[in-house]
């Protein structure tokens, strides 16, 4: 998971809306694993912004040491700064905790750019604005890092919420959420509402602002509108899903759907952008350029490098298309689509022009490791990570940024055949090579 910008074929597939409406599972099933309704104590417990990550306050050790921790569904280690670093205001001091236990084992996590390394241990952990429980969890005490912590981000560690298979140094290191569910009565489910501001926030505004909610153990109805639609978790490592069709302003990209998931598609709160496989990225950008052709932008903008600015309040949202991703549904031959607006994929950037300008970066980028549905996607939706039932739910977020003409949407069902063929089967090579490529 990166914290800046991270990220034999069969044709004729795809989820064209055929008019046929299949019966849809209601989202009010009695056997729902998580508590439903109101989680007042957890609402608004996240702060941050898409470009630097969303974080939750956690306490570690006895007496409790308070730290801000990045919420990352694209990794599986709970790792915290445990030594002085120029970008950290505070760090975990193991020697001050009476409940710290050293596991006498090191951990090293390299990324395409940057890395962190540290020492493994366990300690007591709680989430003040979360469930009223304390758990003993594995902690990687980060002693050295390079290009990992972000200056001004205000977080000091990372909470990897994915599965044990991608934990470091190996899958025997139990992730935090597994420990939480095992040691308490918290249901095996969490949900995220990431709220993009729609405008740049300076440091003090981020500290004062609400960034969203992480509801641990359930679903809060106040955080979304409409219905929740679920897609199966294909495999429990990353939160892997299957995309069956992609549309730009309703126009099908018409690619073999395997391309959309080459070599995987994941939901990752620790990545800023919507990252797409090379072929898909090129087709998508070509289509977005064509849709917005009344204005031209330099190549550096489409590469996510240059910013484009408009006079404050004059951003021409209407010239940019909506993007729809069709996801495999829970019912055979049924899919649903999630649609994001330019308000999600044009990311506001601060401190570059004058206050009379609104400036943006293009937040869709190329990936060599598959599709990554990062913060720009998640900011449009309330996303339910229903681990108990091996599925991920999407509903329109109550806090998503939109205008008077268009809104993000979650719609279905659509008839889509042969969706299983859209998944890519990664050749079983040394697993360690799969998890370091975070380009």
């Amino acid at each position: 998971t990166q914290h800046g910008i991270r990220l034999p074929l069969r044709s004729g597939l795809g989820g064209a809306p055929l008019g046929l409406r299949l019966p849809r599972e209601t989202d009010e099933e009695p056997e729902e694993p998580g508590r439903r309704g109101s989680f007042v104590e957890m609402v608004d417990n996240l702060r941050g912004k898409s470009g630097q990550g969303y974080y939750v306050e956690m306490t570690v050790g006895s007496p409790p040491q308070t730290l801000n921790i990045l919420v990352d569904t694209g990794s599986s280690n709970f790792a915290v700064g445990a030594a002085p670093h120029p970008f950290l205001h505070r760090y975990y001091q193991r020697q001050l905790s009476s409940t710290y236990r050293d596991l006498r084992k090191g951990v090293y996590v390299p990324y395409t750019q940057g890395k962190w390394e540290g020492e493994l241990g366990t300690d007591l952990v709680s989430i003040p604005h979360g469930p009223n429980v304390t758990v003993r969890a594995n902690i990687a005490a980060i002693t050295e890092s390079d290009k990992f912590f972000i200056n001004g981000s205000n977080w000091e560690g990372i909470l990897g919420l994915a599965y044990a298979e991608i934990a470091r140094p190996d899958d025997s290191l139990e992730p935090f959420f597994d420990s939480l569910v095992k040691q308490t009565h918290v249901p095996n489910l969490f949900s995220l509402q990431l709220c993009g501001a729609g405008f740049p926030l300076n440091q003090s505004e981020v500290l004062a602002s609400v960034g969203g909610s992480m509801i641990i153990g359930g679903i809060d109805h106040s955080l979304y509108t409409g219905s929740l639609w679920y897609t199966p978790i294909r495999r429990e490592w990353y939160y892997e899903v299957i995309i069956v069709r992609v549309e730009i302003n309703g126009q099908d990209l018409k690619m073999d759907c395997k391309e959309y998931n080459y070599d995987k598609s994941i939901v990752d709160s620790g990545t800023t952008n919507l990252r797409l496989p090379k072929k898909v990225f090129e087709a998508a950008v070509k289509s977005i350029k064509a849709a917005s052709s009344t204005e031209k932008f330099p190549d550096g903008f489409w590469l996510g490098e240059q910013l484009v600015c408009w006079q404050a309040g004059t951003t021409p949202w209407n010239i940019f298309p909506v993007i729809s991703l069709y996801l495999m549904g829970e019912v055979t031959n049924q899919s649903f689509r999630i649609t994001i607006l330019p308000q999600q994929y044009l990311r506001p950037v601060e401190d570059v022009a004058t206050s009379q300008d609104d400036c943006y970066k293009f937040a869709i980028s190329q990936s060599s490791t598959g599709t990554v549905m990062g913060a720009v996607i998640m900011e449009g939706f309330y996303v339910v990570f229903d681990r108990a039932r091996k599925r991920i739910g999407f509903a329109v977020s109550a806090c998503h940024v939109h205008d008077e003409f268009r809104t993000a949407a979650v719609e279905g069902p659509f008839v889509t055949l042969d969706m299983e063929d859209c998944g890519y089967n990664i050749p079983q090579t040394d697993e360690s090579t799969l998890m370091t490529g975070r380009a």
């Epitope: 330099p298 550096g300 903008f301 240059q306």
Partner: antibody
Framework: QLQLQESGPGLVKPSETLSLTCTVS??????????WGWIRQPPGKGLEWIGN???????YYNPSLKGRVTISVDTSKNQFSLKLSSVTAADTAVYYC????????????WGRGTLVTVSS | EIVLTQSPATLSLSPGERATLSCRAS??????LAWFQQKPGQAPRLLIY???NRATGIPARFSGSGSGTDFTLTISSLEPEDFAVYYC??????????FGGGTKVEIK
Amino acid sequence: QLQLQESGPGLVKPSETLSLTCTVSGGSISSSSYYWGWIRQPPGKGLEWIGNIYYSGSTYYNPSLKGRVTISVDTSKNQFSLKLSSVTAADTAVYYCARLGHGYNYFDLWGRGTLVTVSS
Amino acid sequence: EIVLTQSPATLSLSPGERATLSCRASQSVSSYLAWFQQKPGQAPRLLIYDASNRATGIPARFSGSGSGTDFTLTISSLEPEDFAVYYCQQVYVWPPRTFGGGTKVEIK
């Protein structure tokens, strides 16, 4: 070979509107490869970007000029124009029209410039 | 706002000498920077784009380097026609709007 030529009055009274035209010769203003822009330079001072236009009519303006600027294009005449309203002596400058090339990034071809003096 | 600061304001050199001009951005502009030359009574001329690429027809004695916040224009051996004012411009923020204040290269 493509050339740009500014034209318009060299003297404008305070509070009036400055109007300049840039004629493109040796090539089409309707090329999808370029934006067209205006830059000015007060006597003895540095360069200040005023704004750009694409042949479709899409415009970008310098916010510091506070809504006084209008740039328009006439593809049939292969021209684009600048209007700057409510001028003061501070608007006295050499006004250049230029082509924004190299992937819409750099002013790679300039007109000779025309001096506009704001004075009563 | 990104501010471009050029130094020195004036550089006094003799023909044949090496000229080194600096442009510093108040924050990173990646490699999205250009250099222009302006002679008295003339329009500016694009010399270098994308920090280090020479524009069409620009002699090899002109070279640009740098990325991020610090950029340099080097004229390896000054010719008489090189005495002029040089401006840098960033296009990291688009449309391109910010010019540096200029460096005057004068005959010593």
